[in-house]
């Protein structure tokens, strides 16, 4: 019965960008300005999102799609559809409740967002530290001490970091 009723529902013919207007014998009316319907068969249009304050408009609203926001400089998007803007920090920092704080020794952050992560523990891969880590950069692991025996012809490129962990100090 439900299936049959939905097939006979005149509102199901209303395409995206319109709504089924009960005040006008359920004819399909265009969404009013500043509103949209992204699917067919809608009984109302949704009000467009305003991208202001810490947000700014990435894409304006249309009758069939909501506005898309991004964040003003110094902030970055979080959440589905950029539902929040979070303050950027510098590389080598992470955002805490008290603001941006430097990464603790043994951790790094090479982005303006996210948390400080531990340096790679080269010894877990049987390798040695080729380049020390900093607040902004992970350590670079080099060949294992055995590979550096006399007669070794070249230094092999560092393997990609696999497992986080503290490097030996």
């Amino acid at each position: 019965f439900e299936r049959t009723r939905s097939l006979q529902d005149p509102c199901s013919n209303c395409p995206a960008g319109t709504f089924c207007d009960n005040n006008r014998n359920q004819i399909c009316s265009p969404c009013p300005p500043n509103s949209f319907s992204s699917a067919g068969g809608q009984r109302t249009c949704d009000i467009c999102r305003q991208c202001k304050g810490v947000f700014r408009t990435r894409k304006e609203c249309s009758s069939t799609s909501n506005a898309e926001c991004d964040c003003t400089p110094g902030f970055h998007c979080l959440g589905a559809g950029c539902s929040m803007c979070e303050q950027d920090c510098k590389q080598g920092q992470e955002l805490t409740k008290k603001g941006c704080k430097d990464c603790c020794f043994g951790t790094f952050n090479d982005q303006k967002r996210g948390i400080c992560r531990p340096w790679t523990n080269c010894s877990l891969d049987g390798k040695s530290v080729l380049v020390n880590g900093t607040k902004e950069r992970d350590v670079v692991c080099g060949p294992s001490p055995a590979d550096l025996s006399p007669g070794a012809s070249s230094v092999t490129p560092p393997a990609p970091a696999r497992e986080p962990g503290h490097s030996p100090q």
Epitope: P33, N34, I47, Q50, C51, K52, R56, T57, R58, K59, E60, S62, S65, E68, D70, P73
Partner: antibody, heavy 115, light 107 residues
Framework: EVQLVETGGGLVQPNGSLKLSCAAS????????MNWVRQAPGKGLEWIAR??????????YYADSVKDRFTISRDDSQSMLYLQMNNLKTEDTGMYYC??????WGQGTLVTVSA | DIQMTQSSSYLSVSLGGRVTVTCKAS??????LAWYQQKPGNAPRLLIF???SLETGVPSRFSGSASGNDYTLTITSLQTEDVATYYC?????????FGGGTKLEIK
């Protein structure tokens, strides 16, 4: 950083023409609507034109005071907004601002219509 | 067209005092109202959007409120740098319209 820089203002005689430009940077221009707002000397602000983006078929809107005389247009490849002003009247004298998203304004370009 | 009426063209104010600037819309604007501050020789600066939301970087002494079609900008503890002209604007319905402006003058 968002920047809107208007150019093209100047002195023009009544019934003359002028084309204003606005160079936009620091945001995604081609998916955003843009406005022109003007201000006569010592007077208030007046919205005069709006152009929407491709997703809205570049729809244009005008204040009654400039309809059929002014034309708003855009060049998305250059992130440029334009205002072609024809049949200028003395009452069109003022500072013309390019505006995006209510929050962002250029420094304005001065148009003087005088014999 | 929707008319935006700012009943006071001028307000005589005291530094450190509280100021309210009012604006009335002739029709429903769904709170799509902006308040701007403008100083001589400068472009307008957005203070409030959506009738009540403070724009980034604007001091918290500025606030906006709405009641029906009546809108208010409030400045608590007025500072010398707040002496300017304030405009409301509706951006709900084209043509977008501004109020006539309210100029603050020091007593």
């Amino acid at each position: 950083e968002v920047q809107l820089v208007e150019t093209g203002g100047g002195l023009v005689q009544p019934n003359g023409s002028l084309k204003l430009s606005c160079a936009a940077s620091g945001f995604i221009f081609n998916t955003n609507a843009m406005n022109w707002v003007r201000q006569a000397p010592g007077k208030g602000l007046e919205w005069i034109a709006r152009i929407r983006s491709k997703i809205n078929n570049y729809a244009t809107y005008y204040a009654d005071s400039v309809k059929d005389r002014f034309t708003i247009s855009r060049d998305d490849s250059q992130s440029m907004l334009y205002l072609q002003m024809n049949n200028l009247k003395t009452e069109d004298t003022g500072m013309y601002y390019c505006n995006w998203d209510e929050a962002y304004w250029g420094q304005g370009t001065l148009v003087t219509v005088s014999a | 067209d929707i008319q935006m009426t700012q009943s006071s063209s001028y307000l005589s104010v005291s530094l450190g005092g509280r100021v309210t600037v009012t604006c009335k819309a002739s029709d429903h604007i769904n709170n799509w109202l902006a308040w701007y501050q403008q100083k001589p020789g400068n472009a307008p600066r957005l203070l409030i959007f959506g009738a009540t939301s403070l724009e980034t970087g604007v001091p918290s002494r500025f606030s906006g409120s709405a009641s029906g079609n009546d809108y208010t900008l409030t400045i608590t503890s007025l500072q010398t740098e707040d002496v300017a002209t304030y405009y409301c604007q509706q951006y709900w319905s084209i043509p977008y319209t501004f109020g006539g402006g309210t100029k603050l003058e020091i007593k």
